[in-house]
């Protein structure tokens, strides 16, 4: 005769308030003859949850038809779960007897706990922008989850980060928990298009983690490089000078031309182009009238980027006597 085993496959069952919980229990033998009852807790004070033969259990239904002769499935469903329902549930086989049935064997128990999904992770970056090669901090927060066990990972462009610190609060028992993590990220010059991702995995998410993202474009400032050049060709008595502002981010930029220290108010031609890495290039052309110029013209291209201190590049204009005397439009 096969020895009876009481099988409760789930050690932990996470349920949501208001939903229905299914507690599984199967037996491996029909013997000894007698009922299977469900209890919550152990010891003399345990609570009877379901008894097929007697009592009124309005929220409990059986998964199988217990009246069927060879039934070996004693699983139950408990509807309208509330926080008061948490605890460990045992299916218990009784041997038929008198004046009472005798407890014969208990299942290992299934702990029912309230599961709450974590909120979507919110990732916040630094308040101010920082230049490449520096480290910035990002925080990730998620709230309202239960049970306490949770996994949080950080990624930058798909690569997992290791420099972060995570805290789950509170440390003691609670209905719900919160997680906060701070990651330290070293900025690269090409990070304008980069993303940091905070990924949260929790048992309630059934293997589908939640993600929060932040764009490094909000945290990075790539300062420009300046180059001022004189075009070799001249148009009539005008020389074209170019100021090339390269590889900057964000787009916010003010460019001014100065001629021998005097700021020029007149309009200048310019173009803005975006690079593949998300940075920008700005080119400004300045036409200098050389017919009335002395030999010592110094042009300055000054750039104020994203509210930072202005940077400038100078160019001492090379105007030959030959150029001054020429009046044709063509450059020799």
């Amino acid at each position: 005769e096969e020895e009876l085993q009481m099988i409760q496959p789930e050690k932990l069952l996470l349920v949501t308030v208001g939903k229905t919980a299914t507690l599984h229990c199967t037996v491996t033998s029909l013997l000894p003859v007698g009922p299977v009852l469900w209890f919550r807790g152990v010891g003399p004070g345990r609570e009877l949850i379901y008894n097929q033969k007697e009592g009124h259990f309005p929220r409990v239904t059986t998964v199988s038809d217990l009246t069927k002769r060879n039934n070996m499935d004693f699983s139950i469903r408990i509807s309208s779960i509330t926080p008061a329902d948490v605890g460990t549930y045992y299916c218990v086989k009784f041997r038929k007897g008198s004046p009472e049935n005798v407890e014969f064997k208990s299942g290992p128990g299934t702990e029912m706990a309230l599961g709450a999904k974590p909120s979507a992770p919110v990732v916040l970056g630094p308040a101010a922008r920082t230049t490449p090669e520096h480290t910035v901090s990002f925080t990730c927060e998620s709230h309202g989850f239960s049970p306490r066990d949770i996994t949080l990972k950080w990624f930058k462009n798909g690569n997992e980060l290791s420099d972060f610190q995570t805290n789950v609060d509170p440390t003691g028992q609670s209905v719900a928990y919160s997680i906060r993590s701070t990651a330290r990220v070293v900025l690269d010059p090409w990070d304008v298009r980069s993303q940091v991702i905070c990924e949260v995995a929790h048992v309630t998410l059934q293997g589908d983690p939640l993600r929060g993202t932040a764009n490094l474009s909000e945290a990075i400032r790539v300062p420009p490089t300046l180059e001022v050049t004189q075009q070799p060709m001249r148009v009539g008595n005008q020389v074209n000078v170019t100021c090339q502002v390269r590889k900057f981010y964000p787009q916010s930029l003010q460019l001014t031309w100065s001629e021998n220290g005097n700021v020029c108010q007149r309009e200048t031609a310019s173009t803005l182009t975006e690079n593949k890495d998300g940075t920008y290039n700005w080119t400004s052309w300045f036409l200098v009238n050389i017919s009335d110029q002395r030999d010592d013209v110094v042009l300055t291209c000054q750039v104020k980027h994203d509210g930072q201190l202005a940077v400038s590049k100078r160019l001492a204009l090379e105007v030959t006597v030959h150029q001054k005397d020429q009046s044709s439009d063509a450059t020799p």
Epitope: V42, G43, P44, R46, S98, P99, V102, E103, F104
Partner: antibody, heavy 117, light 107 residues
Amino acid sequence: QVQLVQSGAEVKKPGASVKVSCKASGYTFTSYYMHWVRQAPGQGLEWMGRINPNSGGTKYAQKFQGRVTMTRDTSTSTVYMELSSLRSEDTAVYYCARLGSAYFDLWGRGTLVTVSS
Amino acid sequence: DIQMTQSPSSLSASVGDRVTITCRASQSVDTWLAWYQQKPGKAPKLLIYEASTLESGVPSRFSGSGSGTDFTLTISSLQPEDFATYYCQQANSFPITFGQGTRLEIK
């Protein structure tokens, strides 16, 4: 083999308490409820109560309610019966007995408790 | 509580005799009745359970019958080792109760 081994005889003064042990072996301790039955000298058998070895739940005869305490230690497969406020009429042989479905199919040898001043 | 009354309280019989002991319950116990044999200084020994089922290892000269309130234990041919005290016990409801016993003596 399947047996119930009880602790030895006790002599107690009136008003004292006695604790008798019963160690089960040779079967699954938690699969049978353990009952206690006593027999006064030259008298019949009297049921005192029972303990469920799984939960520790107890049921006592009305006569002994408040004076008797049955406990168990599953780690040693032992049950205990403690009777307090002893009087001379509690002098008896105390048996632990395993209940099958509705009958006592295994008995201990008994423990004689003598209450005498 | 269910009262169990055995009769006779004692009886004398000879080896080879057929002996019948009766047990009456104050209310129906269905067939939840057992019979025990007890010898001096020994624990009771189960003979019959569920009114008529012979316990394993018990000689077939012992038999039980009855249901409801009236039950009998019969020893078809007394053997020397059968001289003892016999108890009936009901397990239909709490508290479990025993008959007062029937002492079987050698004539």
